[in-house]
């Protein structure tokens, strides 16, 4: 028969014949022959291959370097890489999470719209009218101004985006 020019899925063409690819978690040792199938062997400890492949070397699992603020979120297997995340209070600098930076704090006048995670930074938003933040924080949202009316008080000093209103007693002399 004519030698193949293309092979099925999970196969590859070598020496005019179709050989099976190695399954995830295994590496290629020897191509198939007319007598034997492809020879594959398992990846070693701390190695992985995540696709059907003809790689002769497995990839090393990612190292979550604590000196860079990293820790293991999910341990790697022979078929998956280790997933790193950042220590509490830090977040990844990129999608690959190769290093971490401290979560940003929202300055006075700004509140936290979205609290940071291991992979995303704090998102701040300016406090709108009626709200304020008087601290620099990575957790605090903008707080609503105090409602003097509900306390039977009146506004003595208007609030800003950084300060709360100041309430005071009603003027008794007023009819």
């Amino acid at each position: 028969p004519e030698p193949p020019t293309a092979c099925r899925e999970k196969q590859y063409l070598i020496n005019s014949q179709c050989c099976s690819l190695c399954q995830p978690g295994q590496k290629l040792v020897s191509d198939c022959t007319e007598f034997t199938e492809t020879e594959c062997l398992p990846c070693g400890e701390s190695e992985f291959l995540d696709t059907w492949n003809r790689e002769t070397h497995c990839h090393q699992h990612k190292y979550c370097d604590p000196n860079l603020g990293l820790r293991v979120q999910q341990k790697g297997t022979s078929e998956t890489d280790t997933i790193c995340t950042c220590e509490e209070g830090w977040h990844c600098t990129s999608e690959a999470c190769e290093s971490c930076v401290l979560h940003r704090s929202c300055s006075p006048g700004f509140g936290v719209k979205q609290i940071a995670t291991g992979v995303s930074d704090t998102i701040c938003e300016p406090c709108p009218v009626g709200f304020f933040s008087n601290v620099s924080s990575a957790f605090e949202k903008c707080h609503p101004w105090t409602s003097c009316e509900t306390k039977d008080l009146v506004v003595q000093q208007a609030g800003t985006n950084k300060t709360d209103v100041v309430c005071g007693p009603q003027d008794r002399l007023r009819a």
Epitope: N15, E39, L41
Partner: antibody, heavy 115, light 110 residues
Framework: QVQLVQSGAEVKKPGSSVKVSCKAS????????VSWVRQAPGQGLEWMGM????????SYAQKFQGRVTMTRDTSTSTVYMELSSLRPEDTAVYYC????????WGQGTLVTVSS | QSALTQPPSASGSPGQSVTISCTGT?????????VSWYQQHPGNAPKLIIY???KRPRGIPDRFSASKSGNTASLTVSGLQADDEADYYC??????????FGGGTKLTVL
């Protein structure tokens, strides 16, 4: 069909080194690992190590670590096994074979270590 | 790694079946489905007759079969023929790019 052809018999003095070659023909040289196995007279098979011709990476059996070196020459499709600090107990037939599975074997090379 | 354990000898009459065992550990035979068997006639290089526990290379007769249970692999030669008289070796992948052989079994056809 892969064929492995080894170099000829050697007689060596204790303390010296021997380098055995294994030339591959047929198939793609870089697409299979090569194991080395030895067999002392009247004894069983002993795996010595392997070399991956595509990257030249090696793995040696603990027993031979520090005494064996496996190399390859992709231009001539040849792999080499060098054993140093030879002793009389190293007298054996040395085989190269394809892969860990060892589905094709060389004809063997007799190495005699004698003073 | 220490060698896998095989009986030094086995025998059978023509037409009979004989089984050779190969015992390893949970780090080699028990851990991987990468057990091979070789036949070696005197003065010749070994020949692969079984790989990946139970697969036969093309051209090897189905009189040769093999299996594995736990840390022990077995080779069965059925319908014994005079030419089956030879030494038989098992091998197993042992992890970390290492391989270990059995000590060999001399099969005699009576």
């Amino acid at each position: 069909q892969v064929q492995l052809v080894q170099s000829g018999a050697e007689v060596k003095k204790p303390g010296s080194s021997v380098k055995v070659s294994c030339k591959a023909s047929g198939g793609t040289f870089s697409s299979y690992a090569v194991s080395w196995v030895r067999q002392a007279p009247g004894q069983g098979l002993e795996w010595m190590g392997m070399i991956n011709p595509s990257g030249g990476t090696t793995s040696y059996a603990q027993k031979f670590q520090g005494r064996v070196t496996m190399t390859r020459d992709t231009s001539t499709s040849t792999v080499y096994m060098e054993l140093s600090s030879l002793r009389p107990e190293d007298t054996a037939v040395y085989y190269c074979a394809r892969g860990f599975r060892m589905d094709q074997w060389g004809q063997g090379t007799l190495v005699t270590v004698s003073s | 790694q220490s060698a896998l354990t095989q009986p030094p000898s086995a025998s059978g009459s023509p037409g009979q079946s004989v089984t050779i065992s190969c015992t390893g550990t949970s780090s080699d035979v028990g851990a991987y489905n990468f057990v091979s068997w070789y036949q070696q006639h005197p003065g010749n290089a070994p020949k692969l007759i079984i790989y990946d526990v139970r697969k036969r290379p093309r051209g090897i007769p189905d009189r040769f079969s093999a299996s594995k249970s736990g840390n022990t692999a077995s080779l069965t030669v059925s319908g014994l023929q005079a030419d089956d008289e030879a030494d038989y070796y098992c091998s197993s992948y042992a992890g970390n790019n290492n391989l270990v052989f059995g000590g060999g079994t001399k099969l005699t056809v009576l």
